[in-house]
């Protein structure tokens, strides 16, 4: 016999990412004896909550909390019983709830209260359910990406911690109701609201971040539908051969389409609308989402929002990834350059409904949205954020890094559980448990 060194105990943390269209639960784990190390926290498991996002339960708050039960029950199994009490549990809600909070603050409060009531029934260390600001959503996504890719700090072969020379990655998140862009800059922001100062592992980071509410994929699609109803009587971004009936109340009930709402419209009226597979008209329709007319700063992205020039490499995740992945994988189109991305969007927008269905077997109703989605991503990156061909070459579209989903959830937990210290780590000796 010989002495066998037991591997260190693991700690766990749970984050419920309550997005506009659905909720996801992420369970993270890390060795208890290496809490302050970098790249140590990883995803243990995840669970997609069935049904819509919690904001869709405005009229039925208890339904929001009930929807979470299946995933919470899974968490009871995934986290060892002896670790339940010491496992922090957080719920963060994003743009769907920000929108609900704008239009119906009472309903928003009721949903959060109902969810809180259910989460406190579980044996975890529940630490609150709240709505994240757009700035937090952007910054925590940036922290997640750079933590997972070990851009903050690394353990060298000489037994020293050092800051990698490659610098940090910018982060771009395309959600259902908002989109965020976050990257490190050298000069101070002209708009203080867009700047965040971070101290991580003894290093100082000046980060630019902005969140555009109503520029998430789902809200953009809804706004384009409202525009098509107003200006065309057909939808240039939908495929020819795609025929729908639209209840006007569904189109105009979002705060994002309020500005397009006709003065005396009948919310229960149904309108027939068909697609026309017109890439050029679709591009024009998408262009109408961006305003470049005025900028109170030395430079802007769009809608008068300050943005320094994009610099360095970027990781684009969530719906950015899904859109580009559809073009690459389902359509077999190259998207390595901006020119190719535009050509791919035009290609999808030229397809008829029958052609699309033949390319992607199975009746996926949301196939009809990929033209608009691709056109929006292309326009947002090139015209909106100002990526040229050279800068676009530094953008990677990714869903996961180190087997962990890229999004704000991990960064949020790292921050709230102090897993990233502000001070630099000292010299450490590692123990090999292999």
């Amino acid at each position: 016999t010989r002495d066998v060194r037991e591997p260190p105990a693991l700690k766990y943390g749970i984050v419920l990412d309550a997005g506009s269209s659905h909720t996801s639960m992420f369970i993270y784990k890390w060795p208890a004896d290496k809490e302050n190390d970098t790249g140590i926290v990883g995803q243990h498991s995840s669970c997609d909550v069935p049904g819509g996002g919690i904001s869709s339960y405005a009229d039925n708050p208890s339904g929001a909390s009930q929807s979470l039960v299946g995933c919470l029950e899974q968490a009871l199994q995934d986290v060892p019983k002896e670790r339940h009490a010491g496992t922090p549990l957080y719920l963060g809600a994003t743009a769907g709830m920000r929108l609900l909070n704008l239009t119906n603050p009472e309903a928003s409060t009721s949903v959060l209260m109902a969810v809180t009531h259910t989460l406190t029934q579980y044996p975890f260390d529940f630490r609150g359910a709240r709505i994240l600001s757009g700035q937090e959503e952007g910054v925590f996504g940036w922290v997640t990406a750079n933590y997972l890719l070990e851009n903050f700090i690394k353990y060298g072969w000489v037994g020293r911690w050092f800051r990698p020379r490659k610098g940090t990655l910018g982060a771009m998140d395309l959600g259902g109701a908002s989109t965020q862009i976050t990257f490190e800059t050298t000069s101070p922001a002209e708009d203080r609201a867009s700047e965040v100062q971070l101290h991580l592992y003894g290093q100082h980071y000046r980060v630019y971040t902005h969140s555009f509410l109503c520029y998430g994929r789902d809200q953009v699609l809804q706004r384009l539908l409202a525009s098509a109803l107003q200006t065309h009587g057909f939808h240039p971004c939908w495929p020819r051969g795609f025929s729908t009936q639209v209840l006007l109340g569904d189109v105009y009930q979002s705060p994002c389409t309020m500005a397009q709402r006709p003065q005396n419209f009948n919310s229960s009226a149904r309108v027939s609308l068909s697609g026309s597979s017109d890439p050029h008209l679709c591009r024009d329709l998408v262009s109408g989402l961006f305003s470049f007319s005025s900028c109170p700063f030395s430079r802007c992205s769009f809608n008068g929002v300050f943005q320094p020039p994009v610099a360095g490499n970027f990781v684009a995740f969530s719906a950015f990834f899904y859109t580009v992945d559809f073009l690459r994988t389902s359509m077999g189109l190259p998207v390595a350059t901006l020119q190719q991305l535009e050509a791919a969007a035009v290609n999808v927008c030229n397809q008829t409904w029958a052609q699309l269905q033949a390319r992607v077997p199975g009746q996926r109703a949301r196939l009809a949205d990929y033209c608009a989605g691709a056109m929006f991503v292309q326009q947002l990156l090139s015209r909106g954020y100002g990526f040229d061909e050279r800068a676009f070459g530094g953008v990677i579209f990714q869903k996961k890094a180190a087997d962990t989903a890229v999004g704000w959830a991990l960064g949020y937990m790292l921050n709230l559980t102090n897993l990233i210290p502000a001070d630099p780590p000292g010299l450490r000796k590692g123990t090999d448990f292999s």
Partner: antibody
């Protein structure tokens, strides 16, 4: 108000071709919608056969694809079903129906749900020698 | 194809009582956070008519006593207080994937 009416022979011999026509009134079949055929075997559930779209595209149930043709005559505002090499298993009530993608909101996410909400009264077809 | 299994095959309920019909799919009919499930009512000698779409959205003109719920593979049609005219066969139908498929039907009898 859109109305649909099926017509065609009620008795077809085995191995022959079943032919049915659906006449649409109150709406032009080229303006929109998907024009479906659905059948219901005696005492059984419903089975979707296929459709022809307002744009003249076809979509068939893979289980029947080799035997089915759905076509249209725009001058008469009609669409037709032809089912070849019939057997007793094709005995059923045949319905024509108008369908489309209903836009609806789930959460803050709009999507499209294929529904068939204009139906004919159905016509019984018996396959027998 | 997606197979839909309805239960019970027959349901006998007194007027004013609650009726619950279940529909189970062989695979998830959810996509992107939405449930592609519809419910139809077919009265004897008549064509089916749409009651509910997207799992829980009531079609216009359908009485509020009808409601739908569920997601993934498990769906339910509920009639909160059955009335004599509700005697019919009820079908679930999925539109998530080609071909669209229907359940085998549940016959609702009024005692």
């Amino acid at each position: 108000q859109i109305q649909l009416q099926e017509s065609g022979p009620g008795l077809v011999k085995p191995s022959q071709t079943l032919s049915l026509t659906c006449t649409v009134s109150g709406y032009s079949i080229t303006s929109g919608y998907y024009w479906n055929w659905i059948r219901q075997h005696p005492g059984k559930g419903l089975e979707w056969i296929g459709y022809i779209s307002y744009d003249a595209d076809n979509n068939y149930n893979p289980s029947l694809k080799n035997r089915v043709t759905i076509s249209r005559d725009t001058s008469k505002n009609q669409f037709s079903l032809k089912l070849s090499s019939v057997t007793a298993a094709d005995t059923a009530v045949y319905y024509c129906a108008g369908g489309y993608y209903r836009y609806g909101l789930g959460s803050y996410r709009g999507s499209y749900y294929y529904v068939m909400d204009y139906w004919g009264q159905g016509t019984t077809v018996t396959v027998s020698s | 194809e997606t197979v839909l299994t309805q239960s019970p095959a027959t349901l006998s309920v007194s007027p004013g009582e609650r009726a619950t019909i279940s529909c189970k799919a062989s695979q998830s009919v959810d996509y992107d956070g939405n449930s592609y499930m519809n419910w139809y009512q077919q009265k004897p000698g008549q064509a089916p008519r749409l009651l509910i779409y997207a799992a829980s959205n009531l079609e216009s003109g359908i009485p509020a006593r009808f409601s739908g719920s569920g997601s993934g593979t498990d769906f339910t049609l509920t009639i909160s207080s059955v009335e004599p005219e509700d005697a019919a066969t009820y079908y679930c139908q999925q539109s998530n994937e080609d071909p669209p498929t229907f359940g085998g039907g549940t016959k609702l009898e009024i005692k």
